[in-house]
Amino acid sequence: VPRWRQQWSGPGTTKRFPETVLARCVKYTEIHPEMRHVDCQSVWDAFKGAFISKHPCNITEEDYQPLMKLGTQTVPCNKILLWSRIKDLAHQFTQVQRDMFTLEDTLLGYLADDLTWCGEFNTSKINYQSCPDWRKDCSNNPVSVFWKTVSRRFAEAACDVVHVMLNGSRSKIFDKNSTFGSVEVHNLQPEKVQTLEAWVIHGGREDSRDLCQDPTIKELESIISKRNIQFSCKNIYRPDKFLQCVKNPEDSSCTSEI
């Protein structure tokens, strides 16, 4: 008799999830000498232990603590780039500007980027059929709790000037319900962070509006100011050209004509 299996609203665990996590760990530790000491089998065991045999709507940050401990990593606290709804450009940027870091440039973020996972209560099986959707099923699911945990720790580690890339093409440029808006903003430490600098990335080629005046950016400024952190905002009008100028700042087109 086939066992009844809970059907969730979200996609199931990414295929070959254990192999992917292990392979990513090995690759990361080979590329980053400061993480060579990490035992990837232990990392996988800790990752697995966070959600296997547990109800996928009842995961806590505590479940991920063994993994957090194994993945402890020091990134320069003044070189942190947060992002919201514009992950690809943020990653392209840190690939060029190698001294800045997004969460996905850290070991734990790299391991889980773009993956889905969940288990089942009281069985050691990984559920490849479906996993809980944050909205339709529950928020305390393995993926959401993981990102909430690592995002909080990443924000807590930040210092000096923290940068955030925001998507100027969206109706809510700053969204209070995003991971940035609900977790990272509230976990920046005012005693360490002097300024949050937002980069609003424009979508349209001919869009010269000052999106730093957008009501949602003003809302972000208000939240940040109330936390005793200064706020700054820049429009990035041509993201493609911006990346080119990051690669080659001496290019004549990267300097305004007098």
Epitope: H163, E197, S232, C233, Y237, F242, P249, C254, S256
Partner: nanobody, 117 residues
């Protein structure tokens, strides 16, 4: 704005010198060309000197040979050495990015320079 802080202005006689300094915070300073701008009473703000991250410089004709722009990326500062000042140099001076794809939307308080004849 805290991101850009200009200083060093003052009152001088024509022919005198002043050195303006600008401290910028934020990552864009390290990437972007930086410019000195000035706004004379009743006139538009204009860029008068620009320096790339690598130190290449360019000047408006009216200040060429008299003003020198330099930058120290380690200290995030841009300096404008102003020599042989003229009354028409009287203005509020500002620094900002001069990278076309990045909006120079935020400005510091500026620093006032008054040159009397």
């Amino acid at each position: 704005d805290v991101q850009l802080q200009e200083s060093g202005g003052g009152s001088v006689q024509a022919g005198g010198s002043l050195t303006l300094s600008c401290t910028a915070s934020g990552w864009l300073f390290r990437l972007a060309s930086m410019g000195w701008y000035r706004q004379a009473p009743g006139k538009e703000r204009e860029m008068i000197a620009v320096i790339t991250t690598g130190g290449r410089t360019n000047y408006k004709d009216s200040v060429q040979g008299r003003f020198i722009i330099t930058r120290d990326n380690t200290k995030s500062t841009v300096t404008l050495q102003m020599n042989r000042l003229k009354p028409e140099d009287t203005a509020v001076y500002y620094c900002n990015t001069s990278m076309p794809v990045v909006g120079a939307d935020e400005w510091g308080q500026g620093t006032r320079v008054t040159v009397s004849s």
